[in-house]
């Protein structure tokens, strides 16, 4: 679709006569016929098969014609086609006298015709106008003419159809050649498609509109290439969504039971070893000088009791000095002078001579050391207990009294709070830090799912003669305790009133 | 041969969501070429947009509808939804689903037959 | 909001031509499309992109669309053409549809 356009602009007719040679009374007033069809060799009279156009009278005799398309008027003259244009054409402009007011053709003599002529030859499709000039004997026409496309047409022969839009069909403008050129931001064959997010993931992630990056279902982050793991995951990482992957020392579905406590939470103090002994639990292995489960306390040197036989402990800056007891000397009064003659075993221990009665040696009894066996054995001094473990001395022999969740004859081994199924009605049962938490069946409810929740058997009264109604919880039925007198499932019946059965 | 069949309640009462589905059968939901639209048709009267959904759950409303209407896509069951809440009897209509297609530059070239809706108490 | 405006009503007799207009503001610059609609049926698209005929529609319909007039042709119309004919538009992400033309053919 397109306009052949065609703008008179001089018309020269100085002696003012008709092609016949007879002048016009009292002037020539000249209009034009236009007659625009296909191209033909030789142009000759036919149907006007691409159009026609008439104007009004624009002068007398001689003239210019008046550009008048800025006012809309008619010059250039619009001859529009519906069709392909061809790149061809024949061109018939005719140059009529109009006697008077009415110029239709059955209204005018024959003879009335100042000038014909007639041209043909190729025209491209182009904003630019061609200029002609046409004489005959007695007249002269100056004329341009172009072809352009209708609005919303491009293309060399204006047969491509093209509107810009934008909208969700497609954000476009027309090229010159009827093809797309996507408004930035949009791709796709009708720029229809959004150009996201530089670097959004061609798979976990979208967009509806250009520089946007929606995540699809369990990704995440402003690439949507961060998966989303389970929910309620603590310490675990996923490569595909809902995943629960444990980082290194964590356990359980949602990683969150600690598996190396010594890593995680460094509880040894003052330079102690740390050794992970079980979930959330741990022992301290103390350097000389400090003790406490941590190792958080500062032991004196005479803490260690280092003066044997007696020998009292002094501290000093640069470690320790024992006193010793009269018969005794050495660094740690280990030297006696005393012998088996002088009763140093105390505690019914019995003397040994030795290196010929110039030494003696103790054998204590059960409960006693020392080399006088002065001292009474504590088997707690090398803190046994892990775990914050509490060490007794029970006679003979020593025991571990145990923080809650830890067990074992040091305290070594952690407790599973779940380890003796304390979720009632068959509730699952998870291990946290501090405690348990039970995930109850429907129909259940309460720390340890030992509340049930559905109807109450009993809610609807079933038992006669104030008989104490109980659920059992297990079937979800009711039982009657009756009351003296009374027997029956719902103690409806009188003792010594036997109901009555048909058979 | 594609194929779009509207599904739903016949009567919903006033001041209630309408909820219908459209399932397509003989394509895919998720065909970039393609937005799929719900049209309504009031007895004796004429043809009304109400709103179309993309693959990616982009949507768009008629504004006279707007804040009452939403559509929905599920692209795992080939389908996509419709809801229109606090209805009253002006809703009374066919409500068609169809296809709208971007080389036709939005024509819908496939409908399907249509369900009543009719709102009354 | 953009509205497209239709005649109600277009008589025809057999074998000859109806013209059906539907008008909206500069609807030139958008793309026209043509529903035909039988009673008791879901719209048909006959027309699309202002002329083109989706394939089955006979060649007997036909489209244009200029300034703020889009016309659809049926020329030598048939009986079973008796219908609602309904064009719609795009007017930015709305689709708008014109109020609809009962053709009778006599």
């Known amino acids: 679709s397109g306009v052949f356009q065609l703008q008179l602009q001089e018309f020269i007719n100085e002696r003012g006569v008709l092609a016949s040679g007879r002048p016009c009374e009292p002037g020539c007033r000249t209009f034009f016929r236009v007659c625009l069809k296909h191209f033909q060799a030789v142009v000759s009279p036919g149907p006007c098969t691409f159009g026609t156009v008439s104007t009004p009278v624009l002068g007398t005799n001689s003239f210019a014609v008046r550009d008048d398309s800025s006012g809309g008027g008619r010059n250039p003259l619009q001859l529009p086609f519906n069709f392909t244009w061809p790149g061809t054409f024949s061109l018939i402009i005719e140059a009529w006298h109009a006697p008077g007011d009415d110029l239709r053709p059955e209204a005018l003599p024959p003879d009335a015709l100042i000038s014909k002529i007639a041209i043909q030859g190729s025209l491209a499709v182009g904003q630019n106008w061609l200029l002609d000039e046409q004489t005959s004997t007695l007249t002269r026409l100056r004329y341009s003419y172009r072809v352009i496309c209708s609005d919303n047409y491009y293309g060399d022969n204006c047969s491509r159809l093209c509107k810009k839009r934008n909208d969700h069909f497609g954000h476009y403008v027309c090229q010159p050649d009827g093809n797309l050129s996507c408004l930035p931001g949009w791709t796709g064959e009708y720029c229809q498609q959004p150009i996201c997010l530089s670097g959004c993931h061609e798979q976990n992630g979208y967009c509806s509109k250009p520089a946007e990056c929606l995540c699809r279902p369990g990704w995440q982050g402003r690439l949507c290439n961060e998966c989303i793991p389970h929910n309620g995951c603590r310490h675990g990482t996923c490569s595909t969504p809902w995943q629960c992957t444990c980082d290194e020392g964590w356990g359980g579905l949602f990683c969150d039971q600690d598996l190396n406590y010594c890593t995680h939470h460094s509880p040894c103090k003052n330079g102690a070893t740390c050794s992970n002994s079980g979930q959330r639990s741990y022992t301290c292995t103390c350097r000389p000088g400090y003790t406490g489960v941590d190792c958080e306390l500062e032991l004196s040197e005479c803490d260690s009791n280092p003066c044997r036989n007696g020998g009292s402990c002094k501290d000093q800056e640069d470690g320790y000095h024992c006193l010793c007891p009269p018969g005794y000397y050495g660094l740690h009064c280990e030297h006696s002078t005393l012998s088996c003659a002088d009763s140093p075993c105390f505690n019914g221990g019995s003397c040994r001579e030795r290196n010929q009665g110039a030494n003696y040696a103790c054998e204590c009894p059960p409960n006693f050391t020392g080399s006088n066996c002065e001292k009474k054995v504590d088997r707690c001094t090398s803190n046994p207990c892990a775990n914050g473990g509490q060490c007794l001395n029970r006679g003979p022999s020593r025991m571990c009294r145990c923080r809650p969740g830890f067990t074992g004859t040091y305290c070594e081994l952690h407790v599973s709070d779940c380890a003796r199924n304390p979720c009632a009605h068959g509730g699952t049962c998870h291990d946290l830090e501090n405690g348990l938490m039970c995930t109850c069946p429907a129909g259940f409810s309460g720390r340890r799912c030992e509340v049930r929740t559905s109807i109450d058997a009993c809610a609807s009264s079933p038992c006669f003669n104030r008989a104490t109604c109980y659920t059992d919880l297990s079937t979800d039925t009711f039982v009657c305790n009756c009351p003296y007198g009374f027997v029956g499932s719902r103690c409806e019946f009188p003792v010594g009133l036997p109901p009555s059965f048909p058979w | 041969e594609v194929q779009l069949q509207e599904s739903g309640p016949g009567l919903v009462k006033p001041s209630e969501t309408l909820s219908l589905t459209c399932t397509v059968s003989?394509?895919?939901?998720?065909?970039?070429?393609?937005?799929w639209g719900w049209i309504r048709q009031p007895p004796g009267k004429g043809l009304e947009w109400i709103g179309d959904?993309?693959?990616?759950?982009?949507?768009y409303y008629n504004p006279s509808l707007k804040g009452r209407v939403t559509i929905s896509v599920d692209t795992s069951k080939n389908q996509f939804s419709l809801k229109l809440s606090s209805v009253t009897a002006a809703d009374t209509a066919v409500y068609y689903c169809?296809?709208?297609?971007?080389?036709?530059?939005?024509?819908?070239?496939?409908w399907g037959q249509g369900t009543l809706v009719t709102v009354s108490s | 909001s953009y509205e497209l405006t239709q005649p109600p009503s277009v008589s025809v007799s057999p074998g000859q031509t109806a013209s059906i207009t539907c008008s909206g503001q500069?609807?030139?610059?958008?793309?026209a499309s043509w529903y035909q609609q039988k009673p008791g049926q879901s719209p048909v698209l006959v027309i699309y992109?202002?002329?083109k005929r989706p394939s089955g529609i006979p060649e007997r319909f036909s489209g244009s669309n200029s300034g703020d007039t889009a016309t659809l042709t049926i020329s030598g119309t048939q009986p079973m053409d008796e219908a609602d004919y309904y064009c719609q538009a795009w007017d930015r992400d709305t689709g708008v549809f014109g109020y609809g033309t009962k053709v009778t053919v006599l």
């Open positions: 169809a296809r709208e297609d971007v080389i036709l530059r939005g024509g819908s070239d496939y």
């Open positions: 003989g394509g895919s939901i998720s065909n970039s070429r393609y937005h």
């Open positions: 992109e202002d002329s």
């Open positions: 959904i993309y693959y990616t759950g982009s949507t």
């Open positions: 500069r609807l030139g610059d958008k793309y």
